[in-house]
Each structure stands twice: as C-alpha cells, then as structure tokens.
C-alpha cells in the first residue's frame, strides 16, 4: 500500500509542482480551535497541458460530533476516546472554470487525492518529502498498475431484493441537478482490521488513510444530496475481533454478527464498513448486504486493493450503494451512465476495471430514491447533531446550521435559486429553499400531499401550510391488521417473513412445537412454554452464508458467530390471533394501546404508531378538531 517509492506502481504520470495561491488579505477572525490548516486554500497545478486552479475548503463535516476512536492499549485493554482538537487537513472543492468539476484532497503532507474535470479523473500524490510545493505525480487511474476489482454481490442475491429490472423505471434527470428532496446523512462507523493496520504500520497512518477515504466517499455522495459523516473509527492494532476470511461473504457475516453484539456499547451508527488488508478470493474487492441501510445488517466489507486511497473509497461508495438498494448498472436495461466510455464506468458497475469511477448512473439514482421511500430509511433523515459538527457552522456544506436559513452547497455547485449560496440566507422574496413542501420558493398550501402512503402499514402525510418540510413520517397504529400480521412501527412482521429474510424464498416458520425451546450456548435445548416468541425457529430455504445453526429435531435456529446467543423473533411479530411478541413473550395486542387514542381525533384523523392523532388533509394536530386555516389565521402566521 505504501511502498518506499510511491510512483513505482504507476505506468505513466506527469510531474507537477503545485503552487499555492496567496489567501485573501482580509480574513474573518477564525476561532483558535480551527488549527494549522486554513479554512480555504487554492492551488495551481500545471498538468496535461492545462493550468488547473483548485479551490478547496476544509471538509468541516467529515467527523461527527461524538466521533470516537477505539484501539487496543499497550496493556491489552480496549480504549475508546474522543480525540480533542480535531483539526484536520482534508479538503473538498472544485476546479475553476469547470462547472461540473469536483476535488477531494488531503494537504497533510503534500497533496493527495483526486480532482475531476469533465470526464477526466486525475489522481495526485507526492513523489517526495517536499510538502505541498514539492514534486507530485498527476496521473489518470487507468495508469495505476492494478488488477480489475469486482463486487461480490451476486446478481442472484440482488434479484429478489430489488424486484423487477426494467428500463421504464429510469427517467433520467438533468445531470447537474441534485434530487429535490431533503439532504440525507449516513453516520458511518469504520473498522480497520489487523492486516490493514500491519500494512500501514501505525494508528496515525490508519487514521489518515481512513479520513482520506471517507472524505472521498462523502464527495462522491454529495452529488446525490447525501453527506457521509464519520462517527467512529475502530483500529484493530493488536488482533482481529472476529475472523477476517478471504471469503468476503463469511467476513461480512462475521462483521454483522460482531456489530450486533457491540451495538449497545458502541456508537449508534447508520452503517458499518470494514476496511481489510486481507486479499479476498479471486477478483472480489467488496461485499455488502443489499437494501440493508438502517437495519441491523447495514454494512459491507472492503479490501484496500489499490495503492491510492481513491480505490478503496470507490469500493466503499459502491458497497454503500448496495446498502442503499442499488443494483449493478449492467443488470439494468436502459441504465445510463453519463460517464464517457473510455473514462470508465459509473460507481455501481460490477467491476471497477482499470479506472476509478466518479459518478452514479441514472438507475443508481432511481434505486436510491425508491429506497428512500421505505420506512426503513428513516435513520438517514436525521442529521448528525449540527450544533456540534467539528469546526462549527460553515455556509456551503449542505447542512442547515445555526444562523443559516438554507444551504445549497458551495456557490459553484448550488442550483437553488431560492437560496443565496454565499450567505446561506433565503433569496429575496423566498419563503423557503428546501423541503418537499417548498415549491418555487413558496411554502405549499395546507393539505397538499407530500408523502404518499407506501403500504398498508403506512399513513400519508400532508403539508401543514406553515413549514417547508413534510411532517415526520408516521405509520398506522401498532396492532392494525396487515397481510398475515399486525403493523408495528411501519412494518408488518411475521414469522414467515423473518425466516425468508434469513433463509431465502424457501424459508418458512418451523412447527409450533419448535418454539417451546430456549436454546443455550452449545446448542442445548431447554423446554419452555410454546408461545412463538423467543428464538426464531425456521425450516426450509438455504442456510445463510457464514452463519452457524443449531438444529433441534426439525427446528433450525441461527446462532451468533461465537454460538453464545441466537437470532430472536423480533418484537411486534404476530404469534397468534390478536397476539404479538412483546418483550420476549406472546402478549395481547392491548400492550400497544395505553388509551383509546382514536376517540380523541374528532373523526378527522386516525391514531398513529406513536399513539398520537394523525389528521386528515387540512386538519390541525394535536386532536384534529380545527382546520389548519383557522389555526393559522388565529395565530396570524399564515405565509
């Protein structure tokens, strides 16, 4: 990964001497905690016959507020700390004069990263110890000597999870416009295994590479109106916490099992990504659970396969794309990648070939928007605690922070006429700039549908005439009958559905007698009253890869990696007529209802999953007794 002559693995490169442009004379006083690296910096690079001027700003949103680092201390104990003084040297930006350009670089010891102009992706890295003014190699990814890497997610596994693949789904959007929905945020936890640690040699080198990788991933996702924020880094500097197998599917299962056990004492995050120095079998460099974002299986494994960190960043962006419901581009008829063919493929191509991709295809974007319509995706809607983002509020980072009315990104990327991108204040005459209840800079009238009902456990939401955001997603009252079960927090969990999720389409719930067992470590069965709750017992289907099973009679239970615990029947699962699993026992549906909530909704609304009134279009919460127009008129706040 880091040979003594870094350019030894490049076939063709150009030597450049970056020149740093002097900063503006008048600078706003920066808080002392912002550290040694300036907020903004510009460099001129002479490469491929052009002078490129890169304008960069520090990625202030790279690290979440409670960012932690976990490693093993010299005495063998596990240490988790919140590093203080989180100044860093990771930047993002654009190339002057190129409207759809992008740049993601670190300036810690010379310039390292990528900048993209049109269809050309240029990689840059130092050739010596001369710092930012020293000799640098600029080259294109296809000149990096490496083998092609593939994604281990098979077409078979994608098919059942993604549904039919037809060109009709994909209506291309203008390439330069961001999706009009609210920004989504992935709170990311990265685990670095011992092989990668050994390869890089120190905690500092690992930290630097991971921040560089996440900075690149974040830049790639910004085009989809996403931000990727690192909330935790775990470095296995002493030994691996689970077996990292050359078989990526086994490693992924081990990661997810380990994560499930750690979740109570580690960061609550949206997604976990393992970066490994282990060489996966064949050409596979990554493997992920499809459509698993926000679930207990939200994660992927990534081999650090290239000398340049952009390589594993592209792999991570690809695998995270699978977590977000994306299919491989080549599996979809009519899928359009705006990428010029000779420059390579889009991020969700099944194989990265010889060059690193830099954008998502139209069909990836369509899959993403479809995934975001699921109740499951709710974890992406909450921004990291904006009052604590490292470095404080910064205009132009897509986060609407303290003192800002809007934020549409840096001026060169902003396509939102309702927002002044230099001040992050609303444009003159604008009531709003973001949100599904904002149209042409005006708040939509009360009662307009902003989030349709997705399924029988969902409720539709309407604009309230006051706020540009659609109200929080709400679901049918827990206990409402749905296909074969009872609604629970927007899902319709049944034993059959749980067994299919683990064992594939042939999986089904085991006989009722199976549920009379509690199972102890070592697959020891203990009789218990049969109540269809407790350990999930299935039959049929295919054993999930990398999972140990416990078989008692005809009952199959999935164990955790170390065999000490078993996959439980999830809360809310139907366990009999008018009964659901609740706190590990089969209980009456009344456990969901503390009061007769619907009676309080004045026939103008229904009770939702939070036992609150969910009003029909035009009626005002909390009890749907008055029209929204009356309430607004009375408070004098009609827009």
């Amino acid at each position: 990964i880091a040979p003594s002559r870094p350019w030894a693995l490049m076939e063709q490169y150009e030597v450049v001497l970056p020149w740093r442009l002097p900063g503006p004379r008048v600078r706003r006083a920066l808080p002392s905690h912002l550290g040694l690296h300036p907020e903004r910096v510009s460099y001129v690079l002479g490469a491929t016959g052009h002078n490129f001027t890169l304008h960069l700003r520090k990625n202030r949103d790279l690290l979440g507020s409670g960012y932690t680092e976990t490693y093993t201390a010299a005495n063998g104990s596990e240490v988790t700390e919140q590093p203080r003084g989180q100044d860093h040297c990771f930047y993002q930006g654009h190339v002057e004069g190129y409207p759809d350009s992008a740049a993601s670089l670190s300036t810690c010891a010379g310039l390292r990263g990528f900048f993209q102009v049109g269809s050309d992706l240029h990689l840059i890295e130092p050739l010596d110890e001369g710092g930012e003014g020293g000799r640098h190699a600029v080259y294109q990814a296809e000149h990096l000597l490496q083998t092609a890497g593939t994604c281990g997610v098979s077409d078979d596994s994608l098919g059942s999870l993604l549904g039919p693949r037809t060109a009709a789904v994909f209506r291309p959007r203008p390439g330069d416009s961001l999706p009009s929905r609210e920004t989504r945020y992935v709170e990311l936890y990265v685990v670095v295994d011992n092989a990668e640690f050994q390869m890089l040699g120190s905690e500092a080198a690992v930290r630097h590479r991971v921040l560089e990788v996440v900075n690149h991933v974040d830049k790639l996702y910004q085009k989809l109106n996403f931000r990727v924020v690192l909330v935790g880094l775990e470095i296995w500097n002493s030994q691996d916490r689970f077996h990292v197998s050359p078989d990526p599917s086994v490693t992924l299962e081990n990661l997810l099992t380990w994560q499930a056990r750690q979740r109570t004492r580690r960061h609550l995050h949206d997604n976990v990504q393992l970066i490994t120095g282990v060489d996966f079998t064949g050409t596979t460099v990554g493997f992920a659970r499809v459509s698993a974002m926000c679930s207990h299986s939200s994660g992927a494994v990534n081999q650090d396969h290239s000398k340049n960190p952009v390589g594993v960043a592209c792999t991570m962006a690809h695998e995270m794309g699978h977590n977000l419901g994306m299919d491989h581009d080549e599996n979809v008829q009519g899928c359009r990648c705006q990428e010029r063919f000779e420059a390579g493929r889009c991020i969700m191509a099944g194989s990265i070939g010889s060059s690193f991709p830099r954008m998502f295809s139209d069909c990836s974007q369509a899959y993403l928007e479809s995934f975001l319509e699921r109740p499951q995706s709710v974890c992406l809607a909450n921004a990291p605690d904006l009052s604590h983002l490292v470095g404080g509020p910064v205009c132009g980072n897509l986060f609407v922070e303290r003192g800002e009315q809007c934020d549409c990104g840096p001026p060169e990327d902003c396509r939102n006429r309702c927002c002044n991108s230099t001040t992050c204040q609303l444009a003159e005459g604008a009531q709003c700039a973001h949100g599904t209840c904002c149209q042409e800079c005006k708040v939509k009238p009360a009662g307009e549908l902003c989030r349709p009902k997705k399924d029988m456990c969902d409720l539709e939401e309407f604009c309230d005439g006051r706020h540009p955001e659609c109200p929080e997603d709400a679901f049918q009252e827990n206990g409402t009958p749905c296909s074969g079960g009872y609604c629970y927090n927007g899902a319709c969990p049944t034993l059959a559905q749980q067994c299919q999720a683990f064992w594939g389409p042939g999986g089904q719930a085991a006989e009722e007698s199976c549920f009379s067992y509690d199972i102890l470590p070592g697959c020891k069965a203990s009789r218990y009253r049969a109540d269809m709750c407790g350990v999930l017992q299935c039959k049929g289907g295919q054993q999930p890869l990398g999972r140990a099973i416990c078989i008692v009679d005809v009952c199959h239970a999935l164990t955790t990696e170390d065999g000490t615990a078993y996959e439980p029947v999830p809360e809310g699962t139907r366990c009999g007529p008018e009964k659901v699993c609740w706190k590990g026992r089969c209980q009456d549906l009344h456990v969901y209802r503390s009061s007769n909530c619907s009676a309080q909704c004045h026939n103008h609304g229904v009770c939702n999953h939070k036992q609150e009134c969910h009003c029909h279009a035009g009626w005002a919460p909390p009890h749907c007794a008055k029209l929204l127009t009356e309430v607004h008129a009375a408070s004098g706040s009609l827009p």
């Epitope: 509690d518 102890l520 350990v535 078993y566 590990g584």
Partner: nanobody, 119 residues
Framework: EVQLVESGGGLVQAGGSLRLSCAAS????????MGWFRQTPGMKREFVAA????????SYADSVKGRFTISRDNAKNTVTLQMNSLKPEDTAVYYC????????????WGQGTQVTVSS
C-alpha cells in the same frame, strides 16, 4: 435501570476454589438465559457457562466442564458460579450477563470481577 453486580472474585492458589455471585436488580430475570463470560487482556470475551430460565438447563465451555457449576435462584434474582480445581489459565475478569428478552442476545452485562489463580 437494569444492573448486574458480580462479587466473589479474588486471588487463589491453583487447585483452589472460588464462588462468584451475580445479583440482578431493576427487573425480574426468571425467564431469560443468564451466563458467565470471561476476558483476559488482549483477548476477546469468551463464554464460560449459562443457565436457562425455565428448567435450569445448563451449558458449559469445554475448558471448564466438570470443574465449574452454574446455578440460579429466581426468587432472589441471583446466579452463582462455583469454580473448583482452578488453574492459572482461569485467570481473567469474569462477567455476568443476561439476555434482554427470552431468545435475544446478552444485552445486560456486569462490570466484572477479577479472578487471579497463582501457580
């Protein structure tokens, strides 16, 4: 709030015995599996023994079978680990653990008690 508090750890000669006790408070654990795990520096936590909530069925790691005995008193909400014929390799921090709900993983953990076996 659920709390598991271990006691009974200490220093003992090889071949000696110790009795670890775990007191649970904040909830009744009579229905769930409870267990003991141990951890030495730099190693991952390993399973030692567990006991079911209903029939008091027990399970042990191969390394402690025949030497350790787990038992529980549901009336007092306690779990005990009787450790006999102790060996230096039994030296570790011992943790009591309980499932959150029947069938789930161990989500409640004690702070641990140190057991040191000298040769």
């Amino acid at each position: 709030e659920v709390q598991l508090v271990e006691s009974g750890g200490g220093l003992v000669q090889a071949g000696g015995s110790l009795r670890l006790s775990c007191a649970a408070s904040g909830r009744t654990f009579s229905e769930v599996v409870m267990g003991w795990f141990r951890q030495t520096p730099g190693m991952k936590r390993e399973f030692v023994a567990a006991i079911s909530g209903s029939e008091n069925v027990t399970s042990y790691a191969d390394s402690v079978k025949g030497r350790f005995t787990i038992s529980r008193d549901n009336a007092k909400n306690t779990v005990t680990l009787q450790m006999n014929s102790l060996k230096p390799e039994d030296t570790a921090v011992y943790y009591c653990a309980a499932q959150r709900w029947r069938g789930g993983s161990y989500e409640y953990w004690g702070q641990g008690t140190q057991v040191t076996v000298s040769s």
